[in-house]
Interface confidence: low
């Protein structure tokens, strides 16, 4: 294997770095961009989709969780398979699964089916990160590897920017919708879900033009196929550099004898499904065996250390980046509540209310013979009030409650004032006629605040750009470990600044700072993971570590967001401790700069 690694490095040097790698860079970049988009889709559509699908808080939480769960399963599954079946083939299948179910999720109406589609869409895209980095690294010579893998990371950021920009451009346009009867509705948020499937679809189209990784071929004893691909790399680069006459001089490449080839059984043995069953079991056994070998004597220490680094990084990064918008929403809510207008002891008779009431408390009021027609109530509370001979018609409300109120001879016609909006209230001789159809839940709706989140995410992902550029330029100069540890320490320091962010704009600026600093850690971690494992274990290990990363993300998000409105200190402390632990673990890993790809 060492001999193959040295020879392969020499061949890649001869092939040069040029048009072939740059083409592959953009193709794989699209696949990575699809992953960057996936993380944001559900969060962005929730404010709009919650009304359409009548989502309770637990439903919304489950929807957010299911994406990470899907990506976790997908990373492990496709990562393992890509070491056995090939990088290109598995990436094509995983992206196809992603696009098909992302496409379906745009059209399905029910919550259950939407959840299922997003789960499978997540499973599909889960394969993107582990395969893309391994695949690209196998076309890069040692001197350029760190830098160009870091440039590739930029596409994850581009995915986030794309998702935020599209959400901003599409979701607020209520006009972009149609209805087929009362049962089928296609609103603008569904257009957004559809548009978010584009990077994945384009990646599939572009990937069909690219060859399989020659290193994978060599690892699986396919000498001729590997030679053809390497010749294609060489010839493409030489033609682009104006040297078409240069000949690919390699005649023989060392290959590894493949011992555990897929079990093949003769076509006359049993039914087709039995044959496929045997193949699947055989493949599953090989994938599992390969995974367990990452914990064998040779790799156990590296794997455990990498698990620690991936977990702490992900826990703090995802925890904080989801906590930020929640914190901003909390600050907005506090500010909104501070501006609540209180109306004590109103006595209103023979008046027609036909306008919007927002952010008000009416206390101890008496309403006699009043009409509430075509009224919009947003965050309005009526407390200890009396309504007598009143008439409510075409009333829509959100976050509106009647507490300890008495209604006498009052009629409610075509309103969404459902039972739960009357708290300890008494209704005497009052009737509800033709309550509004649809969702009986109180949804926050899509106000300016909801759309503000798209802009914040847009800024947050864009702020990563400088950190990305710096880390790419320095990756091969200062080394992966210094980059990882240094960036983790800087992220840790930037964490502490969060304690001073009391305004919305300060929190956004600090989110940008944290994102910009921590991206270098992610880039270094991706490069390290690719280089620490041999080619027959590379995507398996990467997939497992990426799955662990998603698990840590879910834990981080759950723990951090539970402190919103209680304390800022706990999340900051947790994140700082995790980052400090991560950087100390990172320093114990072996440096891979200047190393040939095993």
């Amino acid at each position: 294997r060492e001999e193959l690694a040295q020879q392969y490095e020499a061949i890649l040097r001869e092939c040069g770095h040029g048009r072939f790698q740059w083409t592959l860079y953009f193709v794989l970049g699209l696949a990575l961009m699809a992953d960057g988009v996936e993380v944001f889709v559900v969060g962005f559509v929730l404010p709009s989709a919650e009304k359409d699908m009548c989502l309770s808080d637990s439903n919304k939480g489950m929807l957010g969780l299911i994406v990470y769960l899907g990506m976790m399963v997908g990373a492990f599954l496709w990562g393992g398979l890509a070491d056995r079946l090939g990088r290109r083939q598995c990436l094509l299948i995983s992206l196809s699964v992603n696009s098909v179910f992302a496409f379906f999720s745009s059209f399905v109406q029910g919550y259950g089916t939407f959840l299922f589609c997003r789960l499978l869409s997540g499973v599909g895209i889960g394969g993107s990160i582990p395969i893309v980095f391994s695949y690209f690294s196998e076309f890069l010579a040692q001197e350029k590897r760190g830098e160009h893998l870091s440039w590739l990371c930029m596409f994850w950021m581009i995915g986030g920017v794309y998702a935020a920009a599209m959400a901003w451009a599409i979701i607020p346009h209520y006009g972009w919708s149609f209805q087929m009867g009362s049962a089928y509705q296609f609103h603008s948020w569904r257009v957004f879900v559809l548009v978010c499937a584009f990077p994945s679809v384009f990646a599939i189209g572009a990937l069909t033009t690219q060859p399989e990784s020659p290193r994978f071929f060599l690892e699986n004893g396919k000498h001729d196929e590997a030679w053809m691909v390497l010749k294609q790399v060489h010839d493409t680069n030489m033609r682009a550099k104006g040297h078409p006459e240069r000949v690919f001089s390699v005649t023989h490449i060392k290959t590894i004898h493949q011992e555990d080839e897929l079990i093949e059984i003769q076509s006359d043995t049993g039914a087709w499904y039995q044959r496929w069953g045997v193949r699947a079991l055989s493949l599953g056994g090989q994938v599992w065996g390969n995974f367990l070998s990452c914990f064998g004597p040779e790799y156990r220490r590296i794997t455990l250390m990498m698990m620690g680094v991936w977990f702490t990084m992900s826990f703090s990064y995802y925890g904080l980046t989801v906590w930020f918008p929640d914190m901003i929403r909390h600050l907005q809510a506090v500010d909104y509540a501070a501006r609540t207008k209180v109306f004590p002891g109103e006595r209103v008779e023979h008046v027609t209310f036909n306008f919007t009431l927002e952010n008000q408390i009416h206390r101890g009021g008496q309403y006699f013979n009043d009409k509430f027609i075509g009224l919009r109530l947003k965050s309005v509370s009526f407390e200890d009030s009396l309504f007598e001979e009143c008439y409510f018609e075409d009333v829509t409300s959100s976050n509106t409650f009647f507490r300890n109120c008495t209604f006498i001879n009052t009629v409610f016609y075509n309103t969404d004032l459902f039972e739960y909006k009357f708290v300890n209230s008494r209704l005497v001789n009052s009737t509800f006629l033709h309550n509004k159809e649809g969702c009986p839940l109180d949804v926050t709706g899509t106000g300016e605040g909801a759309y503000m989140v798209y802009f914040v995410s847009f800024l947050g992902t864009l702020a990563v750009l400088p950190g990305n550029i710096v880390s790419a330029l320095l990756m091969d100069k200062i080394g992966r470990l210094r980059m990882l540890a240094g960036s983790s320490v800087m992220s840790c320091v930037s964490c502490f600044f969060l304690s001073f962010g009391n305004s919305e704009s300060a929190m956004i600026a600090l989110l940008c700072l944290f994102g910009g600093v921590s991206i270098a850690s992610w880039n270094a971690l991706d490069v390290l993971t690719v280089e620490l494992y041999p080619s027959d274990k590379r995507t398996t290990a990467f997939g497992f570590l990426n799955a662990l990363c998603k698990l840590a993300a879910v834990l981080g998000i759950s723990i951090f967001t539970s402190f919103v409105g209680i304390t800022k200190a706990a999340p900051i402390l947790f994140a700082s401790a995790a980052l400090a632990l991560g950087s100390s673990l990172a320093l114990k890993l072996p440096e891979t700069r200047g190393q040939v790809l095993q």
Epitope: K341, V342, E346, R347
Partner: nanobody, 119 residues
């Protein structure tokens, strides 16, 4: 758009009385609280008296006992009865629609009415 027209101002000797009126249009008068404000030369505009839609009144300390705010919902008018006037009451008086005491009024300001109490 809420429109406000103040009237009833004038010049009066110290200890005298005046009754200011304010006609309101462009809003459902009976559901809104109303306030009388004044602006003395070179000073900020300040709220001096307030009446809720239910008829509850509030005053600033320096006019309490001398000024009385009242409203007539049938005429969409709010009044300010000013007794025992002092030279320091000299100002332009405005009325406006306010959801509550201390909250920003939301009508567009009228021309106001000048009250002068010579020393």
């Amino acid at each position: 758009q809420v429109q406000l027209v103040e009237s009833g101002g004038g010049s009066v000797q110290p200890g005298g009385s005046l009754r200011l009126s304010c006609a309101v249009s462009g809003t459902i008068f009976s559901i809104n609280g109303m306030g009388w404000y004044r602006q003395a030369p070179g000073k900020q505009r300040e709220l001096v008296a307030y009446i809720t839609s239910g008829g509850t009144t509030s005053y600033v300390d320096f006019v309490a006992g001398r000024f009385t705010i009242s409203r007539d919902n049938t005429k969409n008018t709010v009044y300010l009865q000013m007794n025992s006037l002092k030279p320091e009451d000299t100002a332009v008086y405005f009325c406006n629609v306010a959801r509550n005491w201390g909250l920003e009024p939301f009508g567009s300001w009228g021309q106001g009415t000048q009250v002068t109490v010579p020393p």
